[in-house]
Amino acid sequence: EPPTACREKQYLINSQCCSLCQPGQKLVSDCTEFTETECLPCSESEFLDTWNRETRCHQHKYCDPNLGLRVQQKGTSETDTICTCEEGLHCMSESCESCVPHRSCLPGFGVKQIATGVSDTICEPCPVGFFSNVSSAFEKCRPWTSCETKDLVVQQAGTNKTDVVCGPQDRQR
């Protein structure tokens, strides 16, 4: 009785169960009554990452420097190449096919999370008591100067973009 379903790591063809090719190898010939499935290793620039019956291996991803990409992890016969972005850039999408410069946080905003090769800068508005007067991809909101600790008084209130201005206390006569 020919099988209608096969075990794990097998496939059904010509009414018989054949072994799938292991990761890193492609199918050359299906099994027969006399021989097991024939598989061959993927070439150096190719890979297959699952048990398969593919007749062609997949090409490793190319990390194009013109798109700001570099190799984070070299591909093997069983894994694809992993690309990441050059310093100062991050991936445009999850598949990381190209890179864009990290955004800077404008004055009034500080860096909540510094960008990585795969994620952009996350900015946050400076809360009361903090300010940022620069456009930066690294600077957090800085606290206003404490005039009191310097034995000074506030002459000009701070904003989210400016620090307080301290001055000497008025002398009492």
Partner: antibody, heavy 113, light 108 residues
């Protein structure tokens, strides 16, 4: 009826090459791999390799890499095995077989000066 | 590579006698891919039994096969004069495919 027709005996000089044909009939040539097997006089059988006529990919026994080259001509349903740099060690009967189920009658190759 | 060792290498039997030839593999083989061939002098090998125990078309029922893992056998229930030949086991489980050294069967 499946038939594999091989050529007659070959007498070749040491260092020369020989190309043995195996003409298939009675089935769709591209449906089955063709295997090649060596049998030295009074000895057992040795698998040389096989070729898939569908994709022209051949797989070799490591022992025969560089010695044997397998090819096919789909238009004439013929498989070929070329043996090169022949020595007396290559004197043997060579069989083609359709995945071991059907065998050719064999071709005797004698290497002698 | 998988080495197949056959025993005996040669044997002589009387007509009507029961014959058993064994084939031992150096590592385990899927029973789906162990086969037996008969070769008569001056002829090509002919499939006798495929996939351990399946009789090839036109082969007399006195031939049978069994086994699993690394141990396989071919049995001739009652020897006949026409069974004089060399018998080979072969594995198609892993490349390179290999054959046993052969068992030459003669008649007493």
């Amino acid at each position: 009826e499946v038939q594999l027709q091989q050529s007659g005996p070959e007498l070749v000089k040491p260092g020369a090459s020989v190309k043995i044909p195996c003409k298939a009939s009675g089935y769709t040539f591209t449906d089955y791999n063709m295997d090649w097997v060596k049998q030295s006089h009074g000895k057992s059988l040795e698998w040389i390799g096989d070729i898939n006529p569908n994709n022209d990919i051949s797989i070799y026994n490591q022992k025969f890499r560089g010695k044997a080259t397998l090819t096919v001509d789909k238009s004439s349903s013929t498989a070929y095995m070329e043996l090169r740099s022949l020595t007396s060690e290559d004197t043997a009967v060579y069989y083609c077989a359709r995945r071991f189920a059907y065998w050719g009658q064999g071709t005797l190759v004698t290497v002698s000066a | 590579e998988i080495v197949l060792t056959q025993s005996p290498t040669t044997m002589a039997a009387s007509p009507g006698e029961k014959i058993t030839i064994t084939c031992s593999a150096s590592s385990s083989i899927s029973s789906n891919y162990l086969h037996w061939y008969q070769q008569k002098p001056g002829s090509s090998p002919k499939v006798l039994i495929y996939r351990t125990s399946n009789l090839a078309s036109g082969v007399p029922v006195r031939f049978s096969g069994s086994g699993s893992g690394t141990s396989y056998s071919l049995t001739i229930g009652t020897m006949e004069a026409e069974d004089v030949a060399t018998y080979y086991c072969q594995q198609g489980s892993s490349i390179p495919y290999t054959f046993g050294g052969g068992t030459k069967l003669e008649i007493k």
